[in-house]
Interface confidence: low
Amino acid sequence: MKVLQEPTCVSDYMSISTCEWKMNGPTNCSTELRLLYQLVFLLSEAHTCIPENNGGAGCVCHLLMDDVVSADNYTLDLWAGQQLLWKGSFKPSEHVKPRAPGNLTVHTNVSDTLLLTWSNPYPPDNYLYNHLTYAVNIWSENDPADFRIYNVTYLEPSLRIAASTLKSGISYRARVRAWAQCYNTTWSEWSPSTKWHNSYREPFEQH
């Protein structure tokens, strides 16, 4: 048994880091493997993560961590019984993938303006809370070409657009994701999408 693709890990910079790797053949990750991780700090204790299968030869482990700070560095040891398969390290602040925003809502009752709001996935005491920017994806269920991305570079988790910039009388979906420039993070996963029926009064044509 051996590692074909070494573990790579990303941190949500709050409480969970996710590590993925591939073995050289089909593996029952949860019964055959253990990932030990330990904060490189005096008197810190080692923790064990039981991996799950992620495809035939793939494994994934969700490492529970206390509040992360930028200096944190973890040692990682991947064991199969008494055999050490791989040894590495992981600095969460250098491999951040933010949590996905939640509670995406489309408010359609504000005259002819659409107001999209969502929740910041971090509590106010987390460093990323005040450092997230967002991308909002809106698309038509009827027309695959009607697909647009709005970059929200301010901190407020909301977006206002004129309803008339979208077609009237058809259904749209929206989703949102986040990233933080300060840690050069990857994008978060997309939030669950929300659907609404776009309708607004066409202005009378002037003749």
Epitope: K2, V3, Q5, T8, L84, W86
Partner: antibody
Framework: EVQLVQSGAEVKKPGESLKISCKGS????????IGWVRQMPGKGLEWMGI????????RYSPSFQGQVTISADKSINTAYLHWNSLKSSDTAIYYC?????????WGQGTLVTVSS | EIVLTQSPGILSLSPGKRATLSCRAS???????LAWYQQKPGQAPRLLIY???SRANGIPDRFSGSGSGTDFTLTISGLEPEDFAEYYC????????FGQGTRLEIK
Amino acid sequence: EVQLVQSGAEVKKPGESLKISCKGSGYRFTTNWIGWVRQMPGKGLEWMGIIYPDDSDTRYSPSFQGQVTISADKSINTAYLHWNSLKSSDTAIYYCARGANWFDPWGQGTLVTVSS
Amino acid sequence: EIVLTQSPGILSLSPGKRATLSCRASQSVSSNFLAWYQQKPGQAPRLLIYGTSSRANGIPDRFSGSGSGTDFTLTISGLEPEDFAEYYCQQYGSSVTFGQGTRLEIK
């Protein structure tokens, strides 16, 4: 420090055999894959194959299968690339590197010149 | 096999500028298994990025990778004199293949 040190440059004639080496240090050599990559003069990188030194499990690129042999001696932390019969078209720099997917670090390269 | 096509072949820029190097795959690269390397004349390649966007140890944060599926990008945010070199992308989702390279030269 993780390091891969390769054997020196070789000048050979077509039809001759050759074995070049790659010695690993600073990490657990036996349980890390080692890959070989070819770079012909002025050209890009071509993946040749990989070996797992602990049990000599070997995987080849279809382009190099049957053309070269990859082997390892885990007792001395060394991987090898072997030709039975060299051709002029084998003239290139050959790199070893740690890993099976991405490669890091790399050896310094071995220049193999095949000319009559 | 997955063929990787890098563009442009040669990119001429001044120090301080932003460089954007493209790598397009002939079919989708599974799980974003894509890496980038830098190679200077007479030297071995050096790993910059793996997993599409994870920087290797010791790589400055001016280097960043992005993309998914068949389109991937290496961005160098502010070019330093030592960044002028050859760059290769490499996929490892289905066997291993390299792109043909992009040469980044001083304008």
